[in-house]
């Protein structure tokens, strides 16, 4: 039985983790730092020209297990790493692009750079 005056609504989980954000900062972020109840991430992917582009930021707890699993997507070269062990832990992450498959060369030597 709840004591008088005690709320039955669940207490929202506090945003306890601070992460470095780069190309992926919310509008209210200060000094390229975001806060989350989930994970910090760093991701590398290739743009349309073949350049490697790194982004980093915060992932909310909901759905982040799936997002951090780094499931391969055909014809999309990307890799993601996540962490929760300390504030700004993602500045130490270093995801790398998966190696080229032989068939990636069919369109020419640097099309899938």
């Amino acid at each position: 039985k709840k004591e008088d005056g005690e709320s039955t609504a669940p207490t929202p989980r506090p945003k306890v983790l601070r992460c470095k954000c780069h190309h992926h900062c919310p509008e209210d972020s200060v000094n390229n730092i975001c806060s989350t109840d989930g994970y910090c991430f760093t991701m590398i992917e290739e743009d349309d020209s073949g350049l490697p582009v790194v982004t980093s930021g915060c992932l909310g707890l909901e759905g982040s297990d799936f997002q951090c699993r780094d499931t391969p997507i055909p014809h999309q070269r990307r890799s993601i790493e996540c962490c929760t062990e300390r504030n700004e832990c993602n500045k130490d992450l270093h995801p790398t692009l998966p190696p080229l498959k032989n068939r990636d060369f069919v369109d020419g030597p640097i099309h899938h750079r």
């Epitope: 470095k20 640097i110 750079r113």
Partner: antibody, heavy 117, light 107 residues
């Protein structure tokens, strides 16, 4: 012998257009990426972007989006940098620089082209 | 974009001295750092790639080391022809960024 030979110095007035060439020899242009790097007088090096020489797709660093354009004439083994609406702050030496497949260090550099106002 | 903080800005050394230049990256770059030499009036030349690999034809007095955020470039025995500006560069993520340079002068 692998070389990147660039066109000669240019003197430009604000508002004019300049087009710099970079002729590759000793290798096949389309098997390596071509990057462009700016060096203002007495300053460091600034990567401007690159062109995927196989697909022809260019990509530009944020500071070089808009007035700058990379292009290719593969039959002549030549890459080009065009600067539109030239500004005084564009005064610099511009280098083309080759990068290997999926590596982003620059193993061969052009001779450099000085553009001044 | 990622910042490469290069120190020192200037080095005045004698022939035969050992020289060390450092670059600190604003984020983990793994091994993705290169070093270049630019002699007066010339184009840059690649010396070191992937932090520690000497490029073809580069004398073995030039070495590089480091991983993550801290990188070091060393000339074990400086020679008169090493008069130049030396730059580090991160080649991990676009836009690729260079250190501000170290000018090496010989006494």
């Amino acid at each position: 012998q692998i070389q990147l030979v660039q066109s000669g110095p240019e003197l430009k007035k604000p508002g004019e257009t300049v087009k710099i060439s970079c002729k590759a020899s000793g290798y096949t242009l389309t098997t390596y990426g071509m990057n462009w790097v700016k060096q203002a007088p007495g300053k460091g090096l600034k990567w401007m972007g690159w062109i995927n020489t196989y697909s022809g797709v260019p990509a530009y660093a944020d500071d070089f989006k808009g007035r700058f354009a990379f292009s290719l004439e593969t039959s002549a083994s030549t890459a080009y940098l065009q600067i539109n609406n030239f500004k005084n702050e564009d005064t610099a030496t511009y280098f083309c620089a080759r990068s290997e497949l999926r590596n982003w260090y620059f193993d061969v550099w052009g001779t450099g082209t000085t553009v001044s106002s | 974009s990622f910042v490469m903080t290069q120190t020192p800005k200037f080095l005045l050394v004698s022939a035969g001295d050992r020289v060390t230049i450092t670059c600190k990256a604003s984020q983990n770059m793994g091994h993705n750092v290169a070093w270049y030499q630019q002699k007066p009036g010339q184009s840059p030349k690649l010396l070191i790639y992937y932090a520690s690999n000497r490029y073809t034809g580069v004398p073995d007095r030039f070495t590089g080391s480091g991983y993550g955020t801290d990188f070091t470039f060393t000339i074990s025995t400086v020679q008169a022809e090493d008069l130049a500006v030396y730059f580090c560069q991160q080649d991990y993520s676009s836009p690729f960024t260079f250190g501000s340079g170290t000018k090496l002068e010989i006494k």
